[in-house]
């Protein structure tokens, strides 16, 4: 029987900069029941607070609701693991909510085959940013990535769309049914999950780009 091993806070994520959650990985339990507590303070403060919500994020997590989340202050946090034989602390972790945003997937993915008379045909893909993300404030720059593949293919073709919310693809296999998905990330945040797939049938007379 031993004191607990050192825990590690390894992940923090915010869906929209208004709330966030951090997760820790327990160290060894020393063969005894172990209690974990997360304490934190914000930059410029000395007063320590305990995690406001150990439930919402699941096991080994701390969730900071709206009233506990500030974009203007860095959070300094650590996890304490305690059993009958003693305690151990994680390293201090510094969190700036701006840099942990992982948005929801983009919405309203629409895919259409365009066949202009005077130009080569193309696949036109359009989407909207996720609802929770407020792009009007200006500091939130969302980047987008598209992936598509013929229904029975194993490999995805990836296209980086930058900040635009529509995209054209010229090189496609005629007569194939394609799956199309899109995801997004803030410049210094994390990729969202892929949006639900949209299917599009490419006409047999679609001319491949040279």
């Amino acid at each position: 029987q031993l004191p607990p091993g050192k825990p590690e806070i390894f992940k923090c994520r915010s869906p929209n900069k208004e709330t966030f959650t951090c997760w820790w990985r327990p160290g060894t339990d020393g063969g005894l029941p172990t209690n974990y507590s997360l304490t934190y303070h914000r930059e410029g403060e000395t007063l320590m607070h305990e995690c406001p919500d150990y439930i919402t994020g699941g096991p080994n997590s701390c969730h900071f609701g709206k009233q506990y989340t500030s974009m203007w202050r860095t959070y300094i946090m650590m996890v304490n693991a305690t059993n009958q034989m003693g305690s151990s602390f994680s390293d201090e972790l510094y969190v700036d909510v701006t840099y942990i945003v992982q948005p929801d997937p983009p919405l309203e993915l629409a895919v259409e085959v365009k066949q202009p008379e005077d130009r080569k045909p193309y696949l036109w893909i359009k989407w909207s940013p996720p609802t929770l993300i407020d792009l009007k404030t200006g500091w939130f720059t969302l980047l987008y990535e598209i992936r598509l593949k013929p229904e029975k293919a194993a490999e995805w073709e990836i296209h980086f769309a930058g900040q635009q919310t529509e995209f054209k693809i010229l090189s496609l296999h005629p007569g194939q049914k394609y799956l199309v998905q899109v995801r997004c990330k803030p410049d210094h945040g994390y990729w969202s999950a892929w949006s639900p797939a949209t299917f599009i049938q490419i006409p047999s007379d679609f001319t491949m780009n040279d």
Partner: antibody, heavy 118, light 112 residues
Framework: EVQLVQSGAEVKKPGSSVKVSCKAS????????IHWVRQAPGQGLEWIGE????????NYNQKFKGRVTITVDKSTSTAYMELSSLRSEDTAVYYC???????????WGQGTLVTVSS | DVVMTQTPLSLSVTPGQPASISCRSS???????????LHWYLQKPGQSPQLLIY???NRFSGVPDRFSGSGSGTDFTLKISRVEAEDVGVYFC?????????FGGGTKVEIK
Amino acid sequence: EVQLVQSGAEVKKPGSSVKVSCKASGYTFTSYWIHWVRQAPGQGLEWIGEIDPSDSYTNYNQKFKGRVTITVDKSTSTAYMELSSLRSEDTAVYYCARSFFTNWFAYWGQGTLVTVSS
Amino acid sequence: DVVMTQTPLSLSVTPGQPASISCRSSQSLVHSNGNTYLHWYLQKPGQSPQLLIYKVSNRFSGVPDRFSGSGSGTDFTLKISRVEAEDVGVYFCSQSTHVPFTFGGGTKVEIK
């Protein structure tokens, strides 16, 4: 204990490439961005670029774009910075550095001296 | 790119005396999220840089309270209230509000 251990000094010819490694330990490698910064002899510090090891997403200083490639090997918790078309002005100590969930550098490697000389 | 200008270039200080380093940026360092990402690093002789102050005025873990940072917008200052022998080295200001991140040219602090 968080450690960033860099590869040894290199001497390179002008026009060639160099690949510097930075092996991380003491934390979950994919959690935090790795940055590369260089320091020419007796000079200040210059940011080269950064990588998110979780998905290999990179941002580069435009000054180096086209010449620099930052990569990671998650299986060995190692970040790499490759600089091509070397010239004498690239002679510098190259540092890797790690952020938290922030954009400043809390941990630094020991540095790798790259000398470009004919 | 944001140009960071430090003054003075070098500073010779008697132990126990105060020291002050100025850093000026070519444009405002207030991020559109409201934060100011101006930091100070110290590079001791023969060592890698180490973080002293983040976001203008916050001491990093383990940094003695004789170090303090202040300023806003484009003008920032690092103060050492009582210089000690272990404080010798080159001090760099750095901004990470705008990409590319940039550093000042450095201020060399030595002991008289």
